[in-house]
Amino acid sequence: EVEKTACPSGKKAREIDESLIFYKKWELEACVDAALLATQMDRVNAIPFTYEQLDVLKHKLDELYPQGYPESVIQHLGYLFLKMSPEDIRKWNVTSLETLKALLEVNKGHEMSPQVATLIDRFVKGRGQLDKDTLDTLTAFYPGYLCSLSPEELSSVPPSSIWAVRPQDLDTCDPRQLDVLYPKARLAFQNMNGSEYFVKIQSFLGGAPTEDLKALSQQNVSMDLATFMKLRTDAVLPLTVAEVQKLLGPHVEGLKAEERHRPVRDWILRQRQDDLDTLGLGLQGGIPNGYLVLDLSMQEALS
């Protein structure tokens, strides 16, 4: 807490300018009017204050706006945003995407801090849903943002926003998240033709059910092994050897290198060895000839 001291004669700040660099902390406290600071916040970032001086300026704003800063001040916080606590940010009502961008810019290049997470949460809740422009902005600054949301939060993403998603934005998503995103992507891209559709849907296929994979196998899509390895195991298991061959096209040869890894390993265990041999890849572990395969999952469902 800075002591209340009178401002020395002739030092009262008439505007926020670089002469304030030379003020001691107590002089800033005594000589800078909080209302003046609030109206000229855009100038603060152009002036190389010390972090200690910025603490004084924050204190002045806190006194002026105990219920939370107005958006006109928030948009120009700059370095001062780094001084804010999540508790400070929870008092804010941020509605402008420009304000959000300005503050994300301040944190650019850093991991998502608790302050930024709180800011985004406030912003998205204020908007009611994660619209395309917001998603565009957030994934530009934080490619992993989408995968940091819970499946429940992802359910509020409208299909139209899916157009803003880039493949790298989904790199860290787990199957539960892709289960929510895949149907939205399918809906968003439904009017595209075969090859264009596959390019767009490919990153989301970790949430695709068996029937959709079967349909894709009829479209000469040539899925690469990296995508195939990210598919849900339960969606891959029912696929026949012929369907996997069509789905992968020339990439089918890559199965040999992945035969010990899921989902390939589990899929091999479900195929007849005869059928696997038709691929000519030397895949081993299929069901020997003459064995009967019982689908116990159906029996369990009936009982």
């Epitope: 300018d17 670089e18 002469s19 660099i21 030379f22 855009d42 100038r43 970032n45 152009a46 002036i47 190389p48 204050f49 010390t50 972090y51 001086q53 700059g78 370095y79 780094l82 810019e105 301040v106 944190n107 650019k108 290049g109 850093h110």
Partner: antibody
Framework: QVQLVQSGAEVKKPGESLKISCQGS????????IGWVRQAPGQGLEWMGW????????NYAPKFQGRVTLTTDTSTSTAYMELRSLTSDDTAVYFC??????????????????WGQGTTVTVSS | EIVLTQSPGTLSLSPGERATLSCRAS???????LAWYQHKPGQAPRLLIY???TRAAGIPDRFSGSGSGTDFTLTISRLEPEDFAVYFC?????????FGPGTKVDIK
């Protein structure tokens, strides 16, 4: 042309003080801040502080606070840097530099567009 | 204070080649308050770039700066013999101003 000319090399003993001068010419001396930067052997550049010649306001890096004093004499367009209680760690080349006037509206710039030639200071017993 | 890290420490290239020098800040630098200087032994440093991307007066257009936040780059599109030197970045957004340790560009 615009230039800053510094005083010559100095050899000092530990505990002594040092005062280097930096004379500006070819521009209005009081319109531009003067900064001081040093470079120890094999090290990077280290900012020491600013002075505004028109009113004598100073701003020092915390590392040098209390040990450095920046002054100017506007009648001779000269800036001075005094460093006290010298140790061998103060062996360095000291530069004065003019703050660039590359400002647009309230977007100030504090890069240094004209530099002195440097003054070599050796502190040794 | 804001700490600047430069990489690589040394860049060995031939005249005519492209040089890409990196400067990373420990805290974001608001309003791109970052400058680049060229420094040759026995000479005064020379300002190349200010505001992260604006060339200083008289600086050839083979020098360009880019970046924002914490990551900044100086690019020399085609190295001339006189470009072999040490390059420093400097932030002037927060006091105290700080410099990076420098990148030495030498002839391969």
């Amino acid at each position: 042309q615009v230039q800053l000319v510094q005083s010559g090399a100095e050899v000092k003993k530990p505990g002594e003080s040092l005062k280097i001068s930096c004379q500006g010419s070819g521009y209005s001396f009081t319109d531009y801040w003067i900064g001081w930067v040093r470079q120890a052997p094999g090290q990077g550049l280290e900012w020491m502080g600013w002075i505004t010649p028109n009113n004598g306001n100073t701003n020092y890096a915390p590392k040098f606070q209390g040990r450095v004093t920046l002054t100017t004499d506007t009648s001779t367009s000269t800036a001075y840097m005094e460093l006290r209680s010298l140790t061998s760690d103060d062996t360095a080349v000291y530069f004065c530099a003019r703050r660039g006037r590359n400002s647009s509206g309230y977007l100030y710039y504090y890069s240094m567009d004209v530099w002195g030639q440097g003054t070599t200071v050796t502190v040794s017993s | 204070e804001i700490v600047l890290t430069q990489s690589p420490g040394t860049l060995s290239l031939s005249p005519g080649e492209r040089a890409t020098l990196s400067c990373r800040a420990s805290q974001p630098i608001v309003a791109s308050h970052l400058a680049w200087y060229q420094h040759k032994p026995g000479q005064a440093p020379r300002l190349l770039i200010y505001g992260a991307s604006t060339r200083a007066a008289g600086i050839p257009d083979r020098f360009s700066g880019s970046g924002s936040g914490t990551d900044f780059t100086l690019t020399i599109s085609r190295l001339e013999p006189e470009d072999f030197a040490v390059y420093f970045c400097q932030q002037y957004g927060i006091s105290p101003f700080t410099f990076g340790p420098g990148t030495k560009v030498d002839i391969k």
